[in-house]
Interface confidence: low
């Protein structure tokens, strides 16, 4: 059941001392690109450095992740932080620099011979050996060991969207991240609040495809805030 999944001993239950906001598992996707914090160039000199606000890892550079800048800081205020190198502490894969992933709280090399097994182990630990399905998806996610050789196809494991082939993005699927199709016009999308407090999503959607943005569906304007339906709409 959904409750047993949410109560499982998983990444969401880790404390947030490393800057990883509680309830923010390092999402890869969702609001339309650039929609949350338009403007503001984060490529600045150190003496003129302005923290780049973010709601999710994909809003940051490939060598960064999105988190609260202070220990136990306000989960609502998150910025792009430099990725963690090998052997540094981590809470999720996106915290580790490219070529590494988070294993047992430490960034380790994504050696292709071990990567598949390690991640499958993590998923199995999170869900036990119960392979029943939720929303029609298998709890056990099969991962591609060729991830670092070719761009991941749909369903391949990934750390960030650049690991995926064109037309796909890296999105959370249970406690791992896999390549999923970028959303097309008319498809339902997820519009997160500016503060990035979007909680735990077991199944994340990709962002809207090029030339599209995630906006409230015209005929849903009168609906209550909680039930508003967002779809990918053309620019």
């Amino acid at each position: 059941t959904l409750n047993s999944v949410l109560n499982s001993n998983a990444i969401k239950n880790l404390p947030p001392p490393l800057g990883g906001a509680a309830g923010h598992p390092g999402s890869a996707v969702s609001a339309a690109p650039g929609i949350l914090y338009p403007g503001g160039n984060k490529y600045q000199t150190i003496d003129n450095y302005q923290p780049y606000p973010c709601a999710e890892d994909e809003e940051c550079g490939t060598d960064e992740y999105c988190a609260s800048p202070t220990r136990g800081g306000d989960a609502g205020v998150q910025i792009c932080l430099a990725c963690r190198k090998r052997r540094k502490r981590c809470m999720r894969h996106a915290m580790c620099c490219p070529g590494n992933y988070c294993k047992n709280g430490i960034c380790v090399s994504s050696d292709q011979n071990h990567f598949r097994g390690e991640i499958e182990e993590t998923i199995t630990e999170s869900f036990g050996n119960d392979h029943s399905t939720l929303d029609g998806y298998s709890r056990r996610t099969t991962l591609s060991s060729k991830m670092y050789h070719t761009k991941g196809q749909e369903g391949s494991v990934c750390l960030r969207s650049s690991d995926c082939a064109s037309g796909l993005c890296c999105a959370r699927h249970f406690w791992s991240k896999i390549c999923k199709p970028v959303l097309k016009e008319g498809q339902v999308c997820t519009k997160h609040r500016r503060k990035g407090s979007h909680g735990l999503e077991i199944f994340q959607r990709c962002y809207c495809g090029e030339g599209l943005s995630c906006r409230i569906q015209k005929d849903h304007h009168q609906a209550s805030n909680s039930s508003r339906l967002h779809t990918c709409q053309r620019h």
Partner: antibody
């Protein structure tokens, strides 16, 4: 094959309205997914997107210029029009029209430009 | 509005040399487009959706990147590649489209 050709008055006085026409062939703006956009380029400078219009009459404008721009189309005559109000010397540029499509997006076909 | 910063502004390369130019976005974008423009000519689409080669473009051109960092690579420079290259993106808020200021590639 797809071709686009821009035409305009050439010279205007400040504060007048610039009217540009893009005549195209090889595709139709009644076809789902088709669009035509306008981009300008001051001499020796970079490209600046002005506006575009989709087959279903959805219009998009450069936010910085939106109050001065009007884009429209005549599907039957295969033409797209752009009006720029209250022109001044900073509007001196080559104006290009270009075809866009929903998939793949990007300006795949360009006119030769009009100064 | 998302700002695209291209670097270098100007560069030169010898025939056969590998050339890479970059485009940095002030906010994350999902795809990047690259255009080539030669003096007196209209721009030409080279790369769409970050890494896809437009029709008729030589395979020595390639695009890559994600998030805020994108690049265009010419595997082996040829004389005819001397031109100015522009990156372009769509942004969602406000709905807009922006170009980078361009990278001028000269033949050494």
């Amino acid at each position: 094959q797809v071709t686009l050709k821009e035409s305009g008055p050439g010279i205007l006085q400040p504060s007048q309205t610039l009217s540009l026409t893009c005549s195209f062939s090889g595709f139709s703006l009644s076809t789902s997914g088709m669009g035509v956009g306008w981009i300008r380029q001051p001499s020796g400078k970079g490209l600046e997107w002005l506006a575009h219009i989709w087959w279903d009459d959805v219009k998009r404008y450069n936010p910085a210029l939106k109050s001065r721009l009007t884009i429209s189309k005549d599907t039957s005559s295969s033409q797209v029009f752009l009006k720029i109000a209250s022109v001044d010397t900073t509007d001196t540029a080559s104006y290009y029209c270009s075809r866009i499509a929903r998939s793949p997006t990007g300006f795949a076909y360009w006119g030769q430009g009009t100064l | 509005q998302i700002v695209l910063t291209q670097s270098p502004v100007i560069m030169s390369a010898s025939p056969g040399e590998k050339v890479t130019m970059t485009c940095s976005a002030s906010s994350s974008v999902s795809y990047m487009y690259w255009y080539q423009q030669k003096p007196g000519s209209s721009p030409r689409l080279l790369i769409y959706d970050t890494s896809n080669l437009a029709s008729g473009v030589p395979v020595r051109f390639s695009g890559s990147g994600s998030g805020t960092s994108y690049s265009l690579t010419i595997s082996r420079m040829e004389a005819e590649d001397a031109a100015t290259y522009y990156c372009q993106q769509w942004s969602s808020y406000p709905p807009a489209l922006t170009f980078g200021a361009g990278t001028k590639l000269e033949l050494k």
